[in-house]
Amino acid sequence: EKPVYELQVQKSVTVQEGLCVLVPCSFSYPWRSWYSSPPLYVYWFRDGEIPYYAEVVATNNPDRRVKPETQGRFRLLGDVQKKNCSLSIGDARMEDTGSYFFRVERGRDVKYSYQQNKLNLEVTALIEKPDIHFLEPLESGRPTRLSCSLPGSCEAGPPLTFSWTGNALSPLDPETTRSSELTLTPRPEDHGTNLTCQMKRQGAQVTTERTVQLNVSYAPQTITIFRNGIALEILQNTSYLPVLEGQALRLLCDAPSNPPAHLSWFQGSPALNATPISNTGILELRRVRSAEEGGFTCRAQHPLGFLQIFLNLSVYSLPQLLGPSCSWEAEGLHCRCSFRARPAPSLCWRLEEKPLEGNSSQGSFKVNSSSAGPWANSSLILHGGLSSDLKVSCKAWNIYGSQSGSVLLLQGRSNLGTGVVPAAL
């Protein structure tokens, strides 16, 4: 009866350079329980080598010399007593490519090389990239542990060296970036930046890297309000904006955050549950009315918090003037000027281009001002007759502009009301 030596092992296996592979293997050999029990030794050899002289690539025999180039990288895994000859190959090198055969020895009776079942190992170029693991989403200000690992790599062979690069790492100690793990406290400005983990096998030319784009979740830090593409100045969460009455107004509220905050506009200073007047970052007023003077609030709502800014809208108008008109009354020549403006304008009367300020000490003229609704009225009373033709002007102005009107008083006319010549702007 022929002794039965059998080996189950795959014919070929492919592994990328620098990675690891486990080759399952089982064997059988003729053994009788009545034999003596010398130790069972198993070996993996390079094909073409004579087992009696060659250094082994892996063995459980402590007396056999292992090839220095495979020492620690080729290992027997599993229990050989249970006929397990599985071979673990770590930190695969191009020069490992080739065929290998298995051999069993037990005393003088069992010695056999399984030359019919060779393992063909092919080591190919490394294309595997490392994985960067972390709990998503990254939150601004919250420390997060990141780890870098290469699928298919193992502890065998020289240690792996790591290097991390990226703008988010600038404050880190360089030593920290040489570990497979690092703790990162992302900032809002790190969102969208690249983080790269590079792995290299010490003493080898095998290098691989992966780059990820950081998705940093952060609440809005600032709100900016734009008008015609120009940012409004903001002081203590309030922005002041003067708007010409009747003008169309389009404001854009921007609050950089990730994911984008929900932007809305409210009238005045709203309560948290108030209803917005706009559910976007855009506030449009077709014609600004003075009634809208006061404020609007832009609120940026975000899962990580909210921010809001108050817009103090001041509605202004250029002075509008009616007059002057003059008429003779009992006490003398009576001229009236009506005007309207926001903010309230200042007004002055001129007689022949000379300003008339307050009331004359000699009583030659008197100025009276009153207001009713949006209009304000001023009157000028000139006592005494006119010596010659006169030009009476009134001028209204505020910080936004001015308007003036004048009337020519012709000597000898009894009714001056018809001779009103309103001044052009």
Epitope: Y5, I50, R65, E105, R108, K111
Partner: antibody, heavy 119, light 112 residues
Framework: QVQLQQSGGGLVKPGTSVKLSCKAS????????IHWVKQRSGQGLEWIGW????????KYNEKFKDKATLTADKSSSTVYMELSRLTSEDSAVYFC????????????WGQGTSVTVSS | DVLMTQTPLSLPVSLGDQASISCRCS???????????LEWYLQKPGQSPKLLIY???NRFSGVPDRFSGSGSGTDFTLKISRVEAEDLGVYYC?????????FGGGTKLEIK
């Protein structure tokens, strides 16, 4: 029990060839290296070469490279040594020896076969 | 080639005496795998050689313990503690570390 049975040899004419055989039994044929050793009458031992059926590995002593050719037939578990262009210098007893194991020794020997080269 | 020099060529002994044979190699016979393949064989008249010692100092199975081997590098010794009649014959040292493998010239152990 490992046995190496030798045959062939005898009286041969100069300039001819002779093929010696060494038939193995009692072990797995591919597991032994078979060596050939020459011993001239009253002289010492000389290693000719080896044949390892496991991987068909053959090694020669340079001195015998043009003299001896080693082959094998796995089906009959036999290793052969052919000696060519015989001269009187080739008259000797030729042994085959089995070498198995890491210990590197020729632990089993054939009985030897005599070759006499004479016209 | 590694030259193996055995001394003495002839060693006359009385039965029960100790015998010692020396073998000197022309170069180190440590194999690239770390082993030293130095062996001793005994050839009795009309017989094939028989293995006594392998790898310098290991006795082959069935070899009596009166045989012992020692040495390292280039100098090796075979000792027989108490010579018996069956020990007579020619002793050869042999190196299997470097091709071509080579034998010593032989030492004849004979009765005084």
């Amino acid at each position: 029990q490992v046995q190496l049975q030798q045959s062939g040899g005898g009286l041969v004419k100069p300039g001819t060839s002779v093929k010696l055989s060494c038939k193995a039994s009692g072990y797995i044929f591919t597991e032994y290296i078979i060596h050939w050793v020459k011993q001239r009458s009253g002289q010492g031992l000389e290693w000719i070469g080896w044949f390892y059926p496991g991987i068909i590995s053959i090694k020669y002593n340079e001195k015998f490279k043009d003299k001896a050719t080693l082959t094998a037939d796995k089906s009959s578990s036999t290793v052969y040594m052919e000696l060519s262009r015989l001269t009187s210098e080739d008259s000797a007893v030729y042994f085959c020896a089995g070498h198995e194991g890491y210990d590197g020794a020729m632990d089993y020997w054939g009985q030897g076969t005599s070759v006499t080269v004479s016209s | 080639d590694v030259l193996m020099t055995q001394t003495p060529l002839s060693l006359p002994v009385s039965l029960g005496d100790q015998a010692s044979i020396s073998c000197r190699c022309s170069q180190s016979i440590v194999h690239s795998n770390g082993n030293t393949y130095l062996e001793w064989y005994l050839q009795k008249p009309g017989q094939s050689p028989k293995l006594l010692i392998y790898r310098v100092s290991n006795r082959f199975s069935g070899v009596p313990d009166r045989f012992s081997g020692s040495g390292s590098g280039t100098d090796f010794t075979l000792k027989i503690s108490r010579v018996e009649a069956e020990d007579l014959g020619v002793y050869y040292c042999f190196q299997g570390s470097h091709v071509p493998w080579t034998f010593g010239g032989g030492t004849k152990l004979e009765i005084k």
